[in-house]
């Protein structure tokens, strides 16, 4: 099929006839078919989260009434351009990104609401938001300022091996340095009980008569 | 590196057709918008058509409306131009050009000669 | 359509002096989508400047770019012999995607 041509609109306009409030009226309503550019917004700055996931809203300001919207996230480092992922949507339905893609996304009107997933610290950058109104004719491209997304690695989690080894150690020691102490202690204690003496015992009176009991004298060599 | 080389150009009569080709190579075809801009003879740059990314869209000037058709093979990397009721007005050096991902005209093939003359 | 205008036809000047170069739109055009090329006789056009003001990759500083709205300028701070050419504008921010007529900058 060959290529169809662009509609043209031209206001014919006479403003002489109109008084001051009319034509202040007049541009203020037509504004947006003189400047025909489309702008987009989007936040400076974005943190990922801790996952590696950065969240942003992209909105257009559209020159004309597209029934079918491009959006592409552009990641731009050292004057290279490289495309992160992109999405066609018709006017009305779901914003809706190839299934490998690291985007996701959801539009309601002239808004998207964007997400990527598995950011890593190098991929810490402006992202930028293109817009292209790709149809009906003519078509629009709308370029948003950037977001610097910023991307913290976490703490990588240690090997779960590596820590039963810690754990193991750990507790090793723990055990020795107890089982050591106790040896200590008790070689300490049998000292303090067993004093140097000759060996002979002396019968004692008994403390208590009716308790009393016969105790014959005994030797306990001492090596 | 970015390389688009045209091919098909030459000498035809007024009302036939011809079939241009550019074959590109040294970067993701589908990503890009790929036009095709004249330049007749001693004149200025006028843009004739663009087809964007998958095909499924594809804008062209009010000069050629009807009378040219842009396509593009995405798995063989190439875009077409195929130009039917050809006029005298239509004799150029016709460029395939790469629309950058910003938008603006980054890469140009060397350009194919095209004369409608009986 | 968006028609782009370009001031002066011709520019003559010797190597060493400044050029100025002027591109008027019939409505305004934001800079993200303005740029400049520059055409060699039997060579296809090159990028010079993208978003009205910023370098393409390999393009020396003396040419620079400038304007917004309706008006904008190219800059050729000194001109060596090789810049000797015609150069045009352009904007890609809606379709038809239009360029300026040219200005053909020539030895003095």
């Known amino acids: 099929m060959a290529c169809l041509g662009f509609q043209r609109h031209k206001a014919q306009l006479n403003l002489a006839t109109r008084t001051w409030p009319c034509t202040l009226l007049f541009f203020l309503l037509f504004i947006p078919v003189f400047c025909k550019a489309m702008h987009v917004a989007q936040p400076a700055v974005v943190l990922a989260s801790s996952r590696g996931i950065a969240s942003f809203v992209c909105e257009y300001a559209s020159p004309g009434k597209a029934t079918e919207v491009r959006v592409t996230v552009l990641r731009q480092a050292d004057s290279q351009v490289t495309e992160v992922c992109a999405a066609t949507y018709m006017m009305g339905n779901e914003l809706t990104f190839l299934d490998d893609s690291i985007c996701t996304g959801t539009s309601s009107g002239n808004q998207v609401n964007l997400t990527i997933q598995g950011l890593r610290a190098m991929d810490t950058g402006l992202y930028i938001c293109k817009v292209e109104l790709m149809y009906p004719p003519p078509y629009y491209l709308g370029i948003g300022n950037g977001t610097q997304i910023y991307v913290i690695d976490p703490e990588p989690c240690p090997d779960s091996d590596f820590l039963l080894w810690i754990l193991a150690a750990v507790s090793s020691g723990l055990f020795f340095y107890s089982f050591l102490l106790t040896a200590v202690s008790l070689s300490k204690m049998l000292k303090k009980r067993s004093p140097l003496t000759t060996g002979v015992y002396v019968k004692m009176p008994p403390t208590e008569p009716e308790c009393e009991k016969q105790f014959q004298p005994y030797f306990i060599p001492i090596n | 590196q970015v390389q688009l080389v045209e091919s098909g150009g030459g000498v035809v009569q007024p009302g036939r057709s011809l079939r241009l080709s550019c074959a590109a190579s040294?970067?993701?075809?589908?990503?890009?918008?790929m036009h095709w801009v004249r330049q007749a003879p001693g004149k200025g740059l006028e843009w004739v058509a663009v087809?964007?990314?998958?095909?499924?869209?594809?804008h062209c000037a009010d000069s050629v409306k009807g009378r040219f058709t842009i396509s593009r093979d995405n798995s063989k990397n190439t875009l077409y131009l195929q130009m039917n009721s050809l006029r005298a007005e239509d004799t150029a050096v016709y460029y395939c050009?790469?629309?950058?991902?910003?938008?603006?005209?980054?890469?140009w093939g060397q350009g194919t000669l095209v004369t409608v003359s009986s | 359509e968006i028609v782009l205008t370009q001031s002066p036809g011709t520019l003559s000047l010797s190597p060493g002096e400044r050029a100025t170069l002027s591109c008027r739109a019939s409505?305004?055009?934001?800079?993200?989508?303005l740029a400049w090329y520059q055409q060699k006789p039997g060579q296809a056009p090159r990028l010079l400047i993208y978003?009205?003001?910023s370098r393409a990759t390999g393009i020396p500083d003396r040419f620079s770019g400038s304007g917004s709205g309706t008006d904008f300028t190219l800059t050729i701070s000194r001109l060596e012999p090789e810049d000797f050419a015609v150069y045009y504008c352009?904007?890609?921010?809606?379709?038809?995607?239009?360029f300026g007529p040219g200005t053909k900058v020539d030895i003095k």
């Open positions: 087809m964007w990314y998958d095909g499924s869209n594809k």
């Open positions: 978003g009205a003001s």
């Open positions: 050009v790469r629309g950058e991902l910003l938008g603006y005209f980054d890469n």
């Open positions: 352009q904007q890609y921010g809606s379709s038809p995607f239009t």
């Open positions: 040294g970067f993701t075809f589908s990503s890009y918008g």
């Open positions: 409505q305004s055009v934001s800079s993200s989508y």
